[in-house]
Amino acid sequence: EDELQVIQPEKSVSVAAGESATLRCAMTSLIPVGPIMWFRGAGAGRELIYNQKEGHFPRVTTVSELTKRNNLDFSISISNITPADAGTYYCVKFRKGSPDDVEFKSGAGTELSVRAKPS
């Protein structure tokens, strides 16, 4: 059986300060059941970048409409990039659990580097 794969096609993305960065992520299956989230960094200290269900992420928009049915595209765009946004971003599939969802599979990561704003 083909297990779900998390595909982050770009290993790295370079964006000028002040511009928007698009971080691409796709799944190969809708199962197992559970949400998808984006993080910067790995391990216990990672920073949550986007979770559709909870939280407020004013600089993040989803590439696909949130009412799209059976969506397999979980790419995001982060606006007004600053040097502080540099780092490696991971698209992570969670498996529904009780009471807490459990990490199931992560993408390989996309390293975001920030260029100086053109003068």
Partner: antibody, heavy 120, light 108 residues
Framework: EVQLVESGGGVVQPGGSLRLSCAAS????????VSWVRQAPGKGLEWVST??????YYADSVKGRFTISRDNSKNTLYLQMNSLRAEDTAVYYC???????????????WGQGTLVTVSS | EIVLTQSPATLSVSPGERVTLSCRAS??????IAWYQQKPGQAPRLLIY???SRDTGIPARFSGSGSGTDFTLTISSLQSEDFGVYYC??????????FGGGTKVEIK
């Protein structure tokens, strides 16, 4: 065209067992979650169970008695029902899950249902 | 468990009338509500998902609205084929998926 066809219903005594099947066609069965929803005579809808890949979820009322499974090579969903009770009497519907956004499931296609009657 | 309360339980309506069905959740479910129609002897049919998105092939006279805890299904001009029972379902927090008790729309 999406089709879900249930079978296996019938009359069974309390404490007995029954296995329901749902044959699916018209969609990529292996990448979708699928569920069982039941409806007692003259009553409303009650969710019973959902299966994703090998992840399974059950209503408290059937936990430990019912087992959901799937065979992706046959595009078929199953519900093994043991220790049946009178209150399990219902039409059992197989339903294809649909997701919206990044999380959240509802049921976009339903079979016509199979009647399970638990009676002595 | 999130409880969905539908009102009224029964609605007697004449064809051509506007119909408003209510579904109230016991806690915030954001916009994670679906609506189904069920006719006697038939399986439920999806009408609306994400509170306000019509399923493919559903006539424009059906519309959904609301977010948080209060949701409405509106049929702008009831047709004879619209009679039946309507159920709301939440998928914000599960298991279990929960359904409302249903609203029966019958001919006046």
């Amino acid at each position: 065209e999406v089709q879900l066809v249930e079978s296996g219903g019938g009359v069974v005594q309390p404490g007995g067992s029954l296995r329901l099947s749902c044959a699916a066609s018209g969609f990529s069965f292996s990448i979708y979650a699928v569920s069982w929803v039941r409806q007692a005579p003259g009553k409303g809808l009650e969710w019973v169970s959902t299966i994703g890949a090998d992840d399974t979820y059950y209503a408290d009322s059937v936990k430990g008695r019912f087992t959901i499974s799937r065979d992706n090579s046959k595009n078929t969903l199953y519900l093994q029902m043991n220790s049946l009770r009178a209150e399990d009497t219902a039409v059992y519907y197989c339903a294809k899950d649909s997701t919206v956004g990044w999380s959240g499931d509802f049921f976009d296609y339903w079979g016509q249902g199979t009647l399970v009657t638990v009676s002595s | 468990e999130i409880v969905l309360t539908q009102s009224p339980a029964t609605l007697s309506v004449s064809p051509g009338e506007r119909v408003t069905l209510s579904c109230r959740a016991s806690q915030n479910v954001r916009s994670d509500i679906a609506w189904y129609q069920q006719k006697p002897g038939q399986a439920p049919r999806l009408l609306i998902y994400a509170a306000s998105s019509r399923d493919t092939g559903i006539p424009a006279r059906f519309s959904g609205s609301g977010s948080g805890t209060d949701f409405t299904l509106t049929i702008s001009s009831l047709q004879s084929e619209d009679f039946g029972v309507y159920y709301c379902q939440q998928y914000y927090d599960w298991p279990p998926f929960t359904f409302g008790g249903g609203t029966k729309v019958e001919i006046k």
